[in-house]
Interface confidence: medium
């Protein structure tokens, strides 16, 4: 028998760590499964935003270009719409995702900078101005939300919320990478995380999640957009790799 479960491989069944994990999982449920993308925009330059009415220019990293954000949102929405098949049944992200406010709010948790814009192209494009000046746009909203991610009103002229569609805040250090100090606007990468429910001693539910993850991996592996460099991982990725190595051995 080939063991490919990382937990079985790297911790002894009677070890303290394993016993504590077992206790935790049994009483509180296992920690979420995570599906994650790290996205860079290698062909895009950083750009400068001039705040209204005055103030220092603010540089914005390549992935925070409006066109790149729209393309990343297209990718994110496409991932949300991935379907898998398990036991002749369709499995969607909605079936397996973490929706913390369910049943009142059934939206999946998506930890993404685009959730500052409620994962909406039209909110991302929301701007206020006249022919002289854009008084507020996605730059203004982003700069506000990274400081107050739980806000329901960005207090700019847009008055848009920062709260994610799942009902919770999106912390900037979870969705951005490559920035210095707390200058999130200098980010060189976007991180998108889809937390998925994990199950204790429920093989069928677990396999439904794994079936969806398999389709997620296939989809992202074959996703073509020359403007984006995408690194990705799914919860099952380590085990998949162990399987691959075992097969080749």
């Amino acid at each position: 028998r080939v063991t490919t479960n990382p937990v079985d491989l790297w911790s002894a069944p009677s070890s303290q760590a394993r016993l504590e994990k077992e206790y935790f999982d049994q009483h509180f449920g296992p920690f979420f499964r995570t599906e994650q993308l790290i996205i860079r925009a290698p062909l895009t330059d950083k750009h400068i935003y001039q705040p209204y009415p005055s103030g220092a220019d603010v540089p914005f990293g390549p992935p925070l270009d409006i066109q790149i954000l729209h393309q990343v949102l297209d990718l994110q929405i496409a991932i949300e719409n991935i379907t898998a098949s398990y036991d002749n049944e369709t499995v969607t992200l909605q079936d397996i995702c973490l929706a913390p406010l369910s049943p009142y709010n059934t939206n999946c948790t998506i930890l993404s900078v685009l959730n500052y814009f409620q994962n909406s192209h039209s909110v991302l494009d929301h701007k206020k101005g006249d022919d002289f000046f854009v008084y507020a746009d996605y730059h203004t909203h982003f700069l506000y939300c990274v400081r107050a991610p739980a806000s329901l009103n960005d207090t700019s002229l847009l008055h848009d919320p920062c709260l994610g569609t799942f009902g919770g805040p999106v912390f900037p250090w979870l969705v951005l990478g490559g920035y210095d100090d707390q200058n999130y606007n200098n980010a060189t990468a976007l991180v998108i995380t889809f937390p998925v429910n994990n199950y204790y001693n429920d093989t069928e539910k677990l396999q439904r999640a794994q079936a969806w993850e398999k389709e997620f991996i296939n989809f992202v592996k074959n996703y073509k957009n020359p403007n984006l460099t995408i690194s990705f991982t799914a919860e099952r990725s380590i085990e998949d790799e162990l399987n691959r190595e075992s097969d080749s051995d």
Partner: antibody, heavy 112, light 107 residues
Framework: EVQLQQSGAELVKPGASVKLSCTAS????????MHWVKQRPEQGLEWIGR????????EYDTKFQGKATITADTSSNTAYLQLSSLTSEDTAVYYC?????WGRGTTLTVSS | DIQMTQSPASLSASVGETVTITCRAS??????LAWYQQKQGKSPQLLVY???TLVEAVPSRFSGSGSGTQFSLKINSLQPEDFGTYYC?????????FGGGTKLEIK
């Protein structure tokens, strides 16, 4: 192509009210501010006020508070200027504007 | 409210001459100043905004300068179509305020 189409000339009696319209094409008024400007015969330009059509928020020059009411209907992409208790002082051309783009103006004549 | 004072109120010049119109703001408006040209019976036409940004299709003989409280519009080599009334206007938030206008006439 961006255009601001204003309603036709008005001749009204003193004391009456009038509502002028400005219909936008080529853009969505929700994305911008719509301004109204007054120009009396042979005089300069006076800013009346502006509206944010997305939420109906308005700002007026203190001189026009109580005189002018600016509204917008996003479904018809139209901004309106209502003037009340009209006097001869209100005889003027009224323009709607975004800054670069201006309507052709509506001539309002207040006369008995 | 910010007051805009424009000078001169009127100006006579000949085709080919260079003229300068000035505008003073009662407080700092950074570079948020626009210049318009208006011909009799027509809507104002934007020439310059942000003090010195020339609107596309406006001839390069027009130029804006200044920041803070002092601004000017310069017209090099006047052409017959340049005659009309010029207004400065601040666009630093609201309310917009216009200068009193400068009537440029042919000498």
């Amino acid at each position: 192509e961006v255009q601001l189409q204003q309603s036709g000339a008005e001749l009204v009696k003193p004391g009456a009210s009038v509502k002028l319209s400005c219909t936008a094409s080529g853009f969505n008024i929700k994305d911008t501010y719509m301004h109204w400007v007054k120009q009396r015969p042979e005089q300069g330009l006076e800013w009346i006020g502006r509206i944010d059509p997305a939420n109906g928020n308005t700002e007026y020059d203190t001189k026009f508070q109580g005189k002018a009411t600016i509204t917008a209907d996003t479904s018809s992409n139209t901004a309106y200027l209502q003037l009340s208790s009209l006097t001869s002082e209100d005889t003027a051309v009224y323009y709607c504007s975004r800054g670069y783009y201006w309507g052709r103006g509506t001539t309002l004549t207040v006369s008995s | 409210d910010i007051q805009m004072t424009q000078s001169p109120a009127s100006l006579s010049a000949s085709v080919g001459e260079t003229v300068t119109i000035t505008c003073r703001a009662s407080e700092n408006i950074y570079s948020y100043l626009a210049w318009y040209q208006q011909k009799q019976g027509k809507s104002p036409q934007l020439l310059v905004y942000n003090a010195k940004t020339l609107v596309e299709a406006v001839p390069s003989r027009f130029s804006g300068s200044g920041s803070g409280t002092q601004f000017s519009l310069k017209i090099n080599s006047l052409q017959p179509e340049d005659f009309g009334t010029y207004y400065c206007q601040h666009h630093y938030g609201s309310p917009w305020t216009f200068g009193g206008g400068t009537k440029l006439e042919i000498k």
